[in-house]
Amino acid sequence: MAKAAAIGIDLGTTYSCVGVFQHGKVEIIANDQGNRTTPSYVAFTDTERLIGDAAKNQVALNPQNTVFDAKRLIGRKFGDPVVQSDMKHWPFQVINDGDKPKVQVSYKGETKAFYPEEISSMVLTKMKEIAEAYLGYPVTNAVITVPAYFNDSQRQATKDAGVIAGLNVLRIINEPTAAAIAYGLDRTGKGERNVLIFDLGGGTFDVSILTIDDGIFEVKATAGDTHLGGEDFDNRLVNHFVEEFKRKHKKDISQNKRAVRRLRTACERAKRTLSSSTQASLEIDSLFEGIDFYTSITRARFEELCSDLFRSTLEPVEKALRDAKLDKAQIHDLVLVGGSTRIPKVQKLLQDFFNGRDLNKSINPDEAVAYGAAVQAAILMGDKSENVQDLLLLDVAPLSLGLETAGGVMTALIKRNSTIPTKQTQIFTTYSDNQPGVLIQVYEGERAMTKDNNLLGRFELSGIPPAPRGVPQIEVTFDIDANGILNVTATDKSTGKANKITITNDKGRLSKEEIERMVQEAEKYKAEDEVQRERVSAKNALESYAFNMKSAVEDEGLKGKISEADKKKVLDKCQEVISWLDANTLAEKDEFEHKRKELEQVCNPIISGLYQGAGGPGPGGFGAQGPKGGSGSGPTIEEVD
């Protein structure tokens, strides 16, 4: 058997996508709803946990217990201003657990709190299951993507989420880098080209500039806004229609969470329509206090509502060009990634900025990141396809990395946008006479002073022999591996004594024990979900069978073929089952199956009697199989002497 494929997962803020490279090409895998992207939503109810479309579809009914935007929390501290700001806009509760944010929900009648890693792991589990359903075998190896601006803590936390989901995370790669890989596959062997990737998704915005030369990718610069995307455009539409509702009906719906949620869903639909039509209509029955809200919006009005947001996308473009030391005329290709790049105005602004240059839209913007991640997964698994074997990926450090030197100064060893993996060494010395040790404090960020940057970790190198200040030579090495994980080593050159740290942000990260616990819990939830799935499946089977039977015997075509007594018998039993179902939606699988078998025992002999000798089987969907003989199965054909 061919070896199991590795998958590429685009773990998005609002939607996620999974792909696999097999038979020389990438397949983006549709979920059980037929959608090639899956909402990054997890919902908790009194009876079950829902992930993906099912979770997003019931958000209006259960906003407090439907979690999304876990990506905005992952790897951050509770006190992080981003977390504090975002919390104001979420209907679910975020609590502080030792400066780690946790999402608090009500699940099966109990209050539960989950780390962002756990929520993300649930989404990843869903993506893993989507892939497994398609491939037909278990999947463990995966490449997962993150925004270019994710720091080490966020990358580590994403990796932890993968582990909790039962994945072996081959590598964490930047989303724009993944998109570049997808693009590069189509464009190998065309000489060195500078490519600007413009990724405007549901929740984040990333601009990256890369050079692609004969299958080798190098990221020259990244910029962006971790808080700009399709949802912001939805918000503008929501605010617009809230005001319109006020004008028309003199009522403020903004405090009614369910009404706003329903309006938001309609706005998202309208926004998508406006990418291909110049007008979209909204029809929401009984939106608020029984009032139906029927309205419409033009593309021009939408563009006006979002004009500042659309224009703001050009700032990171300019910044990336500056960082890459390139003029816009030096960009060969413009690549659109992310669903929001379908918006005509966004395309026009970008095209105008680049003096009418054509935009490359050959990649489905929703799928490009997963596409590239799938290719990268194949490379890491040693795929020998000629499509991928010559491809080399050079990723970058999203932020400068360095240490604190005297006076709280940030001394960078690895500059931001440096190609990784990379290793940099620098000699430092002591600040005081006879200083017995040095405290190495590792930071990431672009500010001059460490207090304005992000502390990743610290360690001490002690046992330095007494010497005047400036004499000892302390060699510090910063080594980033392909996953962007940092190892810092300090060595006293006079003694050879060394100490090191792997920056895993233990202060902000989960411990091995916690991850292990979460892996076990994820398994438990998976088992519970399976029980729930089976329960719902049994319920649906019973419901379908009952309604099929009912309509079968009520069919005018059966007049005269079925006795009134038999018809009554079937209808009475169907009525009993249908009413029982209505009253017992939360019954157990065994109960649903028992009722179905009871109903079949009544109906099957009657229904099959109708179709015997009619030259064909019973009506479709009835499962009206004939009697089984033997020990549950007898001879179906007899030998003729």
């Epitope: 009993e576 249908i578 009413s579 017992n584 065994d590 028992h594 079949e600 009697p627 549950g632």
Partner: antibody, heavy 116, light 112 residues
Framework: QIQLVQSGVEVKKPGASVKVSCKAS????????MNWVRQAPGQGLEWMGW????????TYADDFKGRFTFTTDTSTSTAYMEVRSLRSDDTAVYFC?????????WGQGTLVTVSS | EIVLTQSPDSLAVSLGERATINCKSS????????????LAWYQQKAGQSPKLLIY???TRESGVPDRFSGSGSGTDFTLSIDSLQAEDVAVYYC????????FGGGTKVEIK
């Protein structure tokens, strides 16, 4: 007339298996479900589960999942109940009962004694 | 799982007198669509197989004397034997078929 006739008394050792039969007559066997009910000495009735005689599908009560198996042979209109890995607390009278709106016809019962 | 609790455990009644047996369910046995309660009563005489008396709370099985009657709804049910005869000495069981099946613990009826 409708009748359910069960097999005779069984005496078995712990760990052995037993298969009780229930032969139906007087009606179309596959039109009605067949239930099995246990009654330990001096105790009440315990519903064990039933078999859909048309499809062969079974339902077992929680306490009877695992060691108990219901089958039918539609060619002889007979239902069977087998118990594996017999234990002393399986000592009981086992009844088969036809099900229409309720358990309207019962077999005479089969005493199964499990003793070392 | 639905639990049926019968009371009393045993009952001694004079010949010709009325015997009343109660059966309480842990959840309602009423189906709003069919307007029926899914409770049946069985009689088991010593050394014999059980016999169906009443189904759907109050519908007498054919051949059952009319001194046997059933009543109740939801969770509380009663079997009444209007004028106790000597041949009515037996153990009586209620049984629910609302979801899966379960029997009550039984009530022994004797002559006083």
């Amino acid at each position: 007339q409708i009748q359910l006739v069960q097999s005779g008394v069984e005496v078995k050792k712990p760990g052995a298996s037993v298969k009780v039969s229930c032969k139906a007559s007087g009606y179309t066997f596959t039109n009605y479900g067949m239930n099995w009910v246990r009654q330990a000495p001096g105790q009440g009735l315990e519903w064990m589960g039933w078999i859909n005689t048309y499809t062969g599908e079974t339902t077992y009560a929680d306490d009877f999942k695992g060691r108990f198996t219901f089958t039918t042979d539609t060619s002889t209109s007979t239902a069977y109940m087998e118990v594996r890995s017999l234990r002393s607390d399986d000592t009981a009278v086992y009844f088969c009962a036809r099900y229409d709106h309720a358990m309207d016809y019962w077999g005479q019962g089969t005493l199964v004694t499990v003793s070392s | 799982e639905i639990v049926l609790t019968q009371s009393p455990d045993s009952l001694a009644v004079s010949l010709g007198e009325r015997a009343t047996i109660n059966c309480k369910s842990s959840q309602s046995l009423f189906n709003s669509g069919t307007r029926k309660n899914y409770l049946a009563w069985y009689q088991q005489k010593a050394g014999q197989s059980p016999k169906l008396l009443i189904y759907w709370t109050s519908t007498r099985e054919s051949g059952v004397p009319d001194r046997f009657s059933g009543s109740g709804s939801g969770t509380d049910f009663t079997l009444s034997i209007d004028s106790l005869q000597a041949e009515d000495v037996a153990v009586y069981y209620c049984k629910q078929s609302y979801t899966l099946y379960t029997f009550g613990g039984g009530t022994k009826v004797e002559i006083k």
